[in-house]
């Protein structure tokens, strides 16, 4: 049975040319997490294996950072840059796990951090 | 005694294909994160690819969609195929294992002796 | 990819004394959730395959003598034998596993 919960940094906006932390937080299971993958619709960005490492992605590599932690940070940000994200935790033995961030991006100076949610 | 014996190297023509084979010995391959590094005559260490206890797969960018690895549990093997051969792909093959712990360390602590790859015409 | 440089590429040290090889890596390799260094070291003999001695840049694996130290952080790391043996002759690796891994050129050390 999946116990676990993803709380994420929810809805968020940001300033076009600045940079944005996408955060995921899994809590209240034991399951070890394997690898973390964070798409954004049906593109993969990075991930971080528990044994490998960060893989970012070629496309995206010269605007996207891995972390802090498990997290990713988007950098020159563009209005093309909203829209859905994903953090997906593969753990054993749960299983996935899948966590949203909306993301949007701003042409104006008055972006503003939307509230944390959790999504069972 | 923990053991990892390659076999299935050889000499290929460039567009050929092998298949490497990796058996462990004194751990159960199925719990494990298992790898495969090459290393090219008188040079350093690549990563190739990776598969993890539950069947993750990795590749290095230079092998993808060429090289595949799989693994076989009840044989306790690792296996490697590699398609569409290339000079620069002539290297000894290793298979190596994931150091497990409580945290993991991404650290190889168990290598084969490693089995000789050769792409020539 | 991060790039893994070592110094210097081959290094000739009196039996007893120190040995010191550098690894320099383009990107940090410290991870900031459980402040860990993720770079290990290998030696590897001729004809035969690697092995490790330190994982997490300053940890020695297990049956690896205490001649062996890692030292360092974030993008610049240290082998030092502290006192060289003739069965230390061997080509030294450092690897990052911040980023999928990535090895560096290797040192040779030899006696002197």
């Known amino acids: 049975m999946m116990t676990g919960t993803i709380e994420t940094t929810g809805n968020i906006s940001a300033e076009k040319g600045g940079s944005i932390i996408l955060q995921c937080h899994l809590s209240s299971t034991t399951a070890q997490v394997t690898q973390v993958n964070w798409e954004q619709q049906d593109q993969l960005l990075a991930i971080c294996n528990a044994d490998l490492g960060w893989h970012i992605s070629p496309s995206f590599k010269d605007r996207v950072a891995p972390g802090p932690g498990l997290g990713l940070t988007l950098q020159s940000l563009t209005v093309n840059d909203t829209g859905e994200y994903f953090c997906i935790y593969h753990t054993y033995p749960d299983g996935t796990y899948t966590g949203r961030i909306f993301l949007e991006v701003l042409e104006s100076s008055v972006a503003e951090h939307g509230a944390r949610f959790q999504i069972p | 005694e923990v053991q990892l014996v390659e076999s299935g190297g050889g000499l290929v023509q460039p567009g050929g294909s092998l298949r490497l084979s990796c058996a462990a010995s004194?751990?159960?391959?199925?719990?494990?994160?298992m790898n495969w590094v090459r290393q090219a005559p008188g040079k350093g260490l690549e990563w190739v690819s990776y598969?993890?206890?539950?069947?993750?797969?990795h590749y290095a960018d230079s092998v993808k969609g060429r090289f595949t690895i799989s693994r076989d549990n009840a044989k306790n093997s690792l296996y490697l195929q590699m398609n569409s051969l290339r000079a620069e792909d002539t290297a000894v093959y290793y298979c190596?294992?994931?150091?497990?712990?409580?945290?993991?360390?991404?650290?190889?602590?168990?290598w084969g002796q490693g089995t000789m790859v050769t792409v020539s015409s | 990819d991060i790039v893994m440089t070592q110094s210097p590429d081959s290094l000739a040290v009196s039996l007893g004394e120190r040995a010191t090889i550098n690894c320099k890596s383009s990107?940090?390799?410290?991870?900031?959730?459980?402040?860990?260094?993720?770079l290990a070291w290998y030696q590897q003999k001729p004809g035969q395959p690697p092995k490790l001695l330190i994982y997490?840049?300053?940890t020695r694996e297990s049956g690896v003598p205490d001649r062996f130290s890692g030292s360092g952080s974030g993008t610049d790391f240290t082998l030092t034998i502290s006192s060289l043996q003739a069965e230390d002759v061997a080509v030294y690796y450092c690897?990052?596993?911040?980023?999928?891994?990535?090895f560096g050129g290797g040192t040779k050390v030899e006696i002197k």
């Open positions: 190596a294992r994931h150091r497990i712990g409580r945290s993991p360390s991404r650290a190889f602590d168990i």
């Open positions: 004194g751990f159960t391959i199925g719990g494990y994160s």
């Open positions: 598969i993890s206890s539950s069947s993750t797969i």
């Open positions: 990107q940090s390799v410290l991870f900031s959730s459980n402040n860990k260094n993720y």
């Open positions: 997490w840049a300053s």
């Open positions: 690897q990052q596993s911040y980023f999928f891994p990535t």
